[in-house]
């Protein structure tokens, strides 16, 4: 088992909004849960976009999930990752 490296980034979207993206890379096996939580509960799937789980050329995999949020409400969102029985949560950077 190779645990993922998780990285959260933010980018400007429309006025007053930002897109936050959570990327997991260099993990094996390929089964992974990567999702956004808002206010500690699940964020609707309809408001999230997922990338495919793709090989990254080193025998491991990578994927991402993104959502659009209101600027100033970053604290309310965390990216949750679960892989091979381990888990972690990742805040949006300031």
């Amino acid at each position: 088992t190779v645990p993922p490296m998780v990285n959260v980034t933010r980018s400007e979207a429309s006025e007053g909004n930002i897109t936050v993206t959570c990327r997991a890379s260099s993990f094996y096996p390929r089964n992974i849960i990567l999702t956004w939580r808002q206010d500690g509960v699940s964020l609707s799937h309809a408001t999230q976009q997922w990338g495919d789980v793709l090989p990254d050329g080193n025998g491991t995999y990578q994927t991402w999930v993104a959502t659009r949020i209101c600027r100033g409400e970053e604290q309310r969102f965390t990216c949750y990752m679960e892989h091979s029985g381990n888990h972690s949560t990742h805040p949006v950077p300031s």
Epitope: R37, D39, G40, V41, S42, E73, Q75, R76, F77, T78, Y80, E82, G85, H87, T89, P91
Partner: antibody, heavy 119, light 107 residues
Framework: DVQLQESGPGLVKPSQSLSLTCTVT?????????WNWIRQFPRNKLEWMGY???????NYNPSLKSRISITRDTSKNQFFLQLISVTTEDTATYYC????????????WGQGTLVTVSA | DIQMTQSPASLSASVGETVTITCRAS??????LAWYQQKQGKSPQLLVY???MLADGVPSRFSASGSGTQYSLKINSLQPEDFGSYYC?????????FGAGTKVEIK
């Protein structure tokens, strides 16, 4: 360590308002987290009532929405529960707690305060 | 609302026995589940979060598992301090709801 302490009257008359205070020490309620009220009825059933978060946003259990208000006093690092038009069915032990945004579970609770609704 | 159904409502066990408590959600909660222990006259204490993760300081005789709508809490080699009530709680969506509890008593 975050510590929470509930306070308020132990006896309320039917049709009146129930008002409780949660005093938080060891952490500023404006820094982060969701600050919650949970109650436990005499037969031990637990009910999540609602929260006020670090920015003052509230979220209430729909079963209580018309009767509940959660507010705060940031200068005293306290948050409050008000429940109007109480009946004997509101007799319960009331707890304050908090959760972090990595998941809505409750790592620490106050010691609880029993409120009896009776004429 | 998601309803949480716990079983059994109560059980009697001896020190050293293994006990299992189950919790069923009325919909898929995708491992968004916590377990609490409550002793008489005390506040609930967090045991497990994210369905399987033991909270800080929880002894390794406790373990938890499950997925979808079915979850369980297992206590290996029950100790005197383990007697009390146990509650599950989902955090998939609002409102957050709890199971009705399982009371673990001394046989």
């Amino acid at each position: 360590d975050v510590q929470l302490q509930e306070s308020g009257p132990g006896l309320v008359k039917p049709s009146q308002s129930l008002s409780l205070t949660c005093t938080v020490t060891g952490y500023s309620i404006t820094s982060d987290y969701a600050w919650n009220w949970i109650r436990q009825f005499p037969r031990n059933k637990l009910e999540w009532m609602g929260y006020i978060n670090y920015s003052g946003t509230t979220n209430y259990n729909p079963s209580l929405k018309s009767r509940i208000s959660i507010t705060r006093d940031t200068s005293k690092n306290q948050f409050f529960l008000q429940l109007i038009s109480v009946t004997t069915e509101d007799t319960a032990t009331y707890y304050c707690s908090y959760y972090r945004y990595d998941g809505a579970w409750f790592p620490y609770w106050g010691q609880g305060t029993l409120v009896t609704v009776s004429a | 609302d998601i309803q949480m159904t716990q079983s059994p409502a109560s059980l009697s066990a001896s020190v050293g026995e293994t006990v299992t408590i189950t919790c069923r959600a009325s919909g898929n909660i995708h491992n968004y589940l916590a377990w609490y222990q409550q002793k008489q006259g005390k506040s609930p204490q967090l045991l497990v979060y994210n369905a399987i993760m033991l909270a800080d300081g929880v002894p390794s005789r406790f373990s938890a598992s499950g997925s979808g709508t079915q979850y369980s809490l297992k206590i290996n080699s029950l100790q005197p301090e383990d007697f009390g009530s146990y509650y599950c709680q989902h955090f998939w969506s609002f409102p957050l709801t709890f199971g009705a509890g399982t009371k673990v008593e001394i046989k």
